[in-house]
C-alpha cells in the first residue's frame, strides 16, 4: 500500500477514534447499576459518568444531574476527567500536525522534514490512545474490584458501562491509526533513518568503451 493511502487510512481511523473518545468522555455511562438479584425489585437504573449521573425509571423517564462540586468527586473520576480531556485535546493537536505532514498538503515543503512532521503526528496519536487507555482501565479496575468486594453494599455495585467499551474501541482506533501514520511517514522516506537528509551522488560518466560500468547494476 502506498504511503499516501496509509496516511489517509490512518487519519480516518484517528478521526473516528477521536470522535469515539469525545463520545466516551461525555456519556454518563462509565458505570451502570448491576442487577444482581431479581427478588429485590429495582424500579430504577443508575448511570454514572465523568460529568453527571442519570437515574432511569422503569417507566423510561430519565433524570440527569450534573456533579456540583469537583472536590466531592472520587479520585478516579477526577483523574479520568483530566486524562480523557487531555487525550481529546492532544488528538486535536495531533490532527494539525498530521495534516501539516500529509503529502496532500503544502504547509511543509516536501522532503524529510515533512515526513518527520507526519511521523510526529502518528506518534502523538499513539500517545493519545495510551493516555486515554489509562483512565479507562483504571476506572474499569475499580468497578470490577468493587463488584466482587463482599463489603460493598449490593445496591452500590456497578457494571462496566457502554462509555468504557466505546472508549476502548476509540483508543484502539487511535493507536492503529497512529501506527499507520507512522508507517506512511516511514515508507515516504524510503529509509529508517529520519534524522539526516538523503544524499545523492553524481551519475557516473560512461567508460571509454561507451559501456556503463557493471558496478552500476545489481
Amino acid at each position: 500500500m502506498g504511503s499516501a493511502a496509509l496516511e489517509i487510512l490512518g487519519l480516518v481511523l484517528c478521526l473516528v477514534g477521536w470522535g469515539g473518545l469525545i463520545l466516551a468522555c461525555g456519556l454518563p455511562m462509565w458505570q451502570v447499576t448491576a442487577f444482581l438479584d431479581h427478588n429485590i425489585v429495582t424500579a430504577q437504573t443508575t448511570w454514572k459518568g465523568l460529568w453527571m449521573s442519570c437515574v432511569v425509571q422503569s417507566t423510561g423517564h430519565m433524570q440527569c444531574k450534573v456533579y456540583d462540586s469537583v472536590l466531592a468527586l472520587s479520585t478516579e473520576v477526577q483523574a479520568a476527567r483530566a486524562l480523557t480531556v487531555s487525550a481529546v485535546l492532544l488528538a486535536f493537536v495531533a490532527l494539525f500536525v498530521t495534516l501539516a505532514g500529509a503529502q496532500c498538503t503544502t504547509c511543509v515543503a516536501p522532503g524529510p522534514a515533512k515526513a518527520r512532521v507526519a511521523l510526529t503526528g502518528g506518534v502523538l496519536y499513539l500517545f493519545c490512545g495510551l493516555l486515554a487507555l489509562v483512565p479507562l482501565c483504571w476506572f474499569a479496575n475499580i468497578v470490577v474490584r468493587e463488584f466482587y468486594d463482599p463489603s460493598v453494599p449490593v445496591s452500590q455495585k456497578y457494571e462496566l458501562g457502554a462509555a468504557l467499551y466505546i472508549g476502548w474501541a476509540a483508543t484502539a482506533l487511535l493507536m492503529v491509526g497512529g501506527c499507520l501514520l507512522c508507517c506512511g511517514a516511514w515508507v515516504c522516506t524510503g529509509r529508517p533513518d529520519l534524522s539526516f537528509p538523503v544524499k545523492y551522488s553524481a551519475p557516473r560518466r560512461p567508460t571509454a568503451t561507451g559501456d556503463y560500468d557493471k558496478k552500476n547494476y545489481v
Epitope: N39, I40, S74, P150, S151
Partner: antibody, heavy 116, light 112 residues
Framework: VKVVESGGGLVQPGRSMKLSCAAS????????MAWVRQSPKKGLEWVAS????????YYEDSVKGRFTISRDNAKSTLYLQMNSLRSEDTATYYC??????????WGQGVMVTVSS | DIVMTQSPSFLAVSVGETVTINCKSS????????????LAWYQQKPGQSPKLLIH???TRESGVPDRFIGSGSGTDFTLTISSMQAEDVAIYYC?????????FGAGTKLEL
C-alpha cells in the same frame, strides 16, 4: 481487636459535634468501618459506612447531608462529623469494624445527647 | 428498606431449656448468585456493646459456643439456643447484611 470512641456529650439542637474512634489490633486500612447508634426509641440503627481508603461513603437517609464519615488510615482513626443535630439523634454511638457488611467488633459506645 | 421483625420481644427462660427466637424480613435477601442468606445475629449483654454471633444465617463466628444455632431461608429465620446457660442472658438482634440501609430487628430480651 480494640475500638475506642470519644467525643460524646450534651449538645444543643442545630449545633455540631465530632466523634472519633481509635482502632488497634488489626490493619485499619484493610477494613470498611461504620458507625451504628442505639436509642431506646429506635433500637439499633446503622448510621454510616466508609470504604478502605475513604473514597466511598454510605449514609442512612435521615443523616444524609448532615453527617460526614471520614477516616485517617495513618492514625487508624475513624470520625463522624455531626452537623445540624436534632433531638432524634440522641443515642449511644458505636464505632464498628465492618467487613462483609457485618459489624464484627464494636467499641464501648459514646453517649450523644441533643437537648436544649 | 428491608424491615426486620423479631418475635417474641421478651422471653423468660430456664437454664438448660431450648430457646427459639424468630426473625422475619419484609423481603427476601437470598442472593441468587451464591444462594446465601445475608442474615446475622448479635448478642448484647447488659451494659455491653453488641457481639456478632452468626452471619449468613447459620455460620457461627469463631469462639461462639455450638449451642447457638442459626437457621432459616428466604424471609424466615431462627436463632436457637439448644441448652440455655445463665451467661446467655442478653438481648438478641437479627440484622440483614445484604444492602444499605442495614437494618436490625427490635430485639428479643432473654431473662432467667
Amino acid at each position: 481487636v480494640k475500638v475506642v470512641e470519644s467525643g460524646g456529650g450534651l449538645v444543643q439542637p442545630g449545633r455540631s459535634m465530632k466523634l472519633s474512634c481509635a482502632a488497634s489490633g488489626f490493619t485499619f486500612s484493610d477494613y470498611f468501618m461504620a458507625w451504628v447508634r442505639q436509642s431506646p426509641k429506635k433500637g439499633l440503627e446503622w448510621v454510616a459506612s466508609i470504604n478502605y481508603g475513604g473514597s466511598r461513603t454510605y449514609y442512612e437517609d435521615s443523616v444524609k447531608g448532615r453527617f460526614t464519615i471520614s477516616r485517617d488510615n495513618a492514625k487508624s482513626t475513624l470520625y463522624l462529623q455531626m452537623n445540624s443535630l436534632r433531638s432524634e439523634d440522641t443515642a449511644t454511638y458505636y464505632c464498628a469494624r465492618h467487613p462483609h457488611r457485618l459489624f464484627d467488633y464494636w467499641g464501648q459506645g459514646v453517649m450523644v445527647t441533643v437537648s436544649s | 428498606d428491608i424491615v426486620m421483625t423479631q418475635s417474641p420481644s421478651f422471653l423468660a427462660v430456664s437454664v438448660g431449656e431450648t430457646v427459639t427466637i424468630n426473625c422475619k424480613s419484609s423481603q427476601s435477601f437470598l442472593s441468587s448468585g451464591n444462594q446465601e442468606n445475608y442474615l446475622a445475629w448479635y448478642q448484647q449483654k447488659p451494659g455491653q456493646s453488641p457481639k456478632l454471633l452468626i452471619h449468613l444465617a447459620s455460620t457461627r463466628e469463631s469462639g461462639v459456643p455450638d449451642r447457638f444455632i442459626g437457621s432459616g431461608s428466604g424471609t424466615d429465620f431462627t436463632l436457637t439456643i439448644s441448652s440455655m446457660q445463665a451467661e446467655d442472658v442478653a438481648i438478641y438482634y437479627c440484622q440483614q447484611h445484604y444492602d444499605i440501609p442495614y437494618t436490625f430487628g427490635a430485639g428479643t430480651k432473654l431473662e432467667l
